[in-house]
């Protein structure tokens, strides 16, 4: 697979390869994964891409699966290194704020919060 | 604070400290604190507060602004409890790959990607 | 490699809107290392900040202009813009956008208007 | 609001040293920028955080802030260095940010 696809097509190709897989994917009757139990997923990256590696693992490979846990491996580096650029930038405390403000904005709108 | 207060109504409360805080908080012209480059907010929320670790040790403290670091505690520790329950549940393997094509789902229409 | 490149028209009308827009390219707006930044320079002084504009929409004004200025931000196309309204000979000069991290890191070439009827 | 104080114009023959002040009040407890503008061009940082030069900035430039006064210097002053210098801050008071009135530097001869 080319790195140069966009990850928006990565994604959007990923999602049809995985509705493709499925019958394959769920073959083991006794496998059991860690599943988030809500659904801010972005928190969770690191335990659902811990997931798949226990499902490649188990899951006979060949065609286009293999397809499919490449594009997943893709994604993965991806957010990787959407995390590193969490912390690259050193600014001012009044753009800091801003980046604060924007968050618990996004969180209170968006977030399902669960009390 | 009690920590009964509703996390949403904890978020809309220091939303609102922020604001009235901001003059006092922005006064150090020289502090530098690390803001992430993209919206992908939860990828960042480790970040995020160790600035606010960082712009807490550098305020003077007292009255309301207190209160503003007292509730950003509670709401690292809300945090904290939805990151542990990434891996609490362990599911039968058509339960994970519902919540991995969730999460591609939302990545698909929701994240900010930039290839 | 960030580059921006400013885009409006050169000659407007004395009371009229001002309006100018910055596309950005190379990086993304929505960057949240950046504010994106108006500036303007009149013939032969020194320069003049504006305004300018956080991804999130906060913005902040010149407290001398603040009265007549907006900037506002598209991030689906990876543009911010600028308003001056009720303009005068006062507002001919070359306008400029910007990057704003911890200072003015990348700039447009500028782009003269001229305030005559 | 705050304001920043230049000197309109400075004068040095090559091979000299130029230094442009930016007078402000108690701007020592600031971090100063400045900008090199030539005829025509958008402005050029050459001086960021009082005293560092960006990538490609010789190291003839440089830069001092104490007190109520910053400095911008430029050693061994090339034909090339003529331009105009605008020192700028934040004013953290009010998130805004301040100009100063730009000092045209010639090199004589």
């Known amino acids: 697979i080319p790195t140069e696809i966009p990850t928006s097509a990565l994604v959007k190709e990923t999602l049809a390869l995985l509705s493709t897989h499925r019958t394959l994917l769920i073959a083991n009757e006794t496998l059991r994964i860690p599943v988030p139990v809500h659904k801010n997923h972005q928190l969770c990256t690191e335990e659902i891409f811990q997931g798949i590696g226990t499902l490649e693992s188990q899951t006979v490979q060949g065609g286009t699966v293999e397809r499919l846990f490449k594009n997943l491996s893709l994604i993965k580096k991806y957010i990787d290194g959407q995390k590193k650029k969490c912390g690259e930038e050193r600014r001012r405390v009044n753009q800091f704020l801003d980046y604060l403000q924007e968050f618990l904005g996004v969180m209170n709108t968006e977030w399902i919060i669960e009390s | 604070i009690p920590t009964e207060i509703p996390t949403s109504a904890l978020v809309k409360e220091t939303l609102a400290l922020l604001s009235t805080h901001r003059t006092l908080l922005i006064a150090n012209e020289t502090l530098r604190i690390p803001v992430p480059v993209h919206k992908n907010h939860q990828l960042c929320t480790e970040e995020i507060f160790q600035g606010i670790g960082t712009l807490e040790s550098q305020t003077v403290q007292g009255g309301t602004v207190e209160r503003l670091f007292k509730n950003l505690s509670l709401i690292k520790k809300y945090i904290d409890g939805q990151k542990k329950k990434c891996g609490e549940e362990r599911r039968r393997v058509n339960q994970f790959l519902d919540y991995l094509q969730e999460f591609l789902g939302v990545m698909n229409t929701e994240w900010i990607i930039e290839s | 490699q960030v580059q921006l490149q400013e885009s409006g028209p050169g000659l407007v009308k004395p009371s009229q809107t001002l309006s100018l827009t910055c596309t950005v390219s190379g990086g993304s707006i929505s960057n949240g290392g950046y504010y994106w930044s108006w500036i303007r320079q009149h013939p032969g002084k020194g320069l003049e900040w504006i305004g300018y504009i956080y991804y999130s929409g906060s913005t902040y004004y010149n407290p001398s202009l603040k009265s007549r200025v907006t900037i506002s931000v598209d991030t689906s196309k990876n543009q911010f813009s600028l308003k001056l309204s009720s303009v005068t000979a006062a507002d001919t000069a070359v306008y400029y956008c910007a990057s704003l991290g911890n200072w003015f890191d990348y700039w447009g070439q500028g782009t003269l208007v001229t305030v005559s009827s | 609001s705050y304001v920043l104080t230049q000197p309109p114009s400075v004068s040095v023959a090559p091979g000299q040293t130029a230094r442009i002040t930016c007078g402000g009040n108690n701007i020592g407890s600031k971090n100063v920028y400045w900008y090199q503008q030539k005829p025509g061009q958008a402005p050029v940082l050459v001086v960021h955080?009082?005293?560092d030069r960006p990538l490609g900035i010789p190291e003839r430039f440089s830069g001092s802030n104490s007190g109520n006064t910053a400095t911008l210097t430029i050693s061994r002053v090339e034909v090339g260095d003529e331009a105009d210098y605008s020192c700028q801050v934040w004013d953290s008071s009010s998130d805004h940010v301040v100009f100063g009135g730009g000092t045209k530097l010639t090199v004589l001869g």
């Open positions: 955080d009082d005293s």
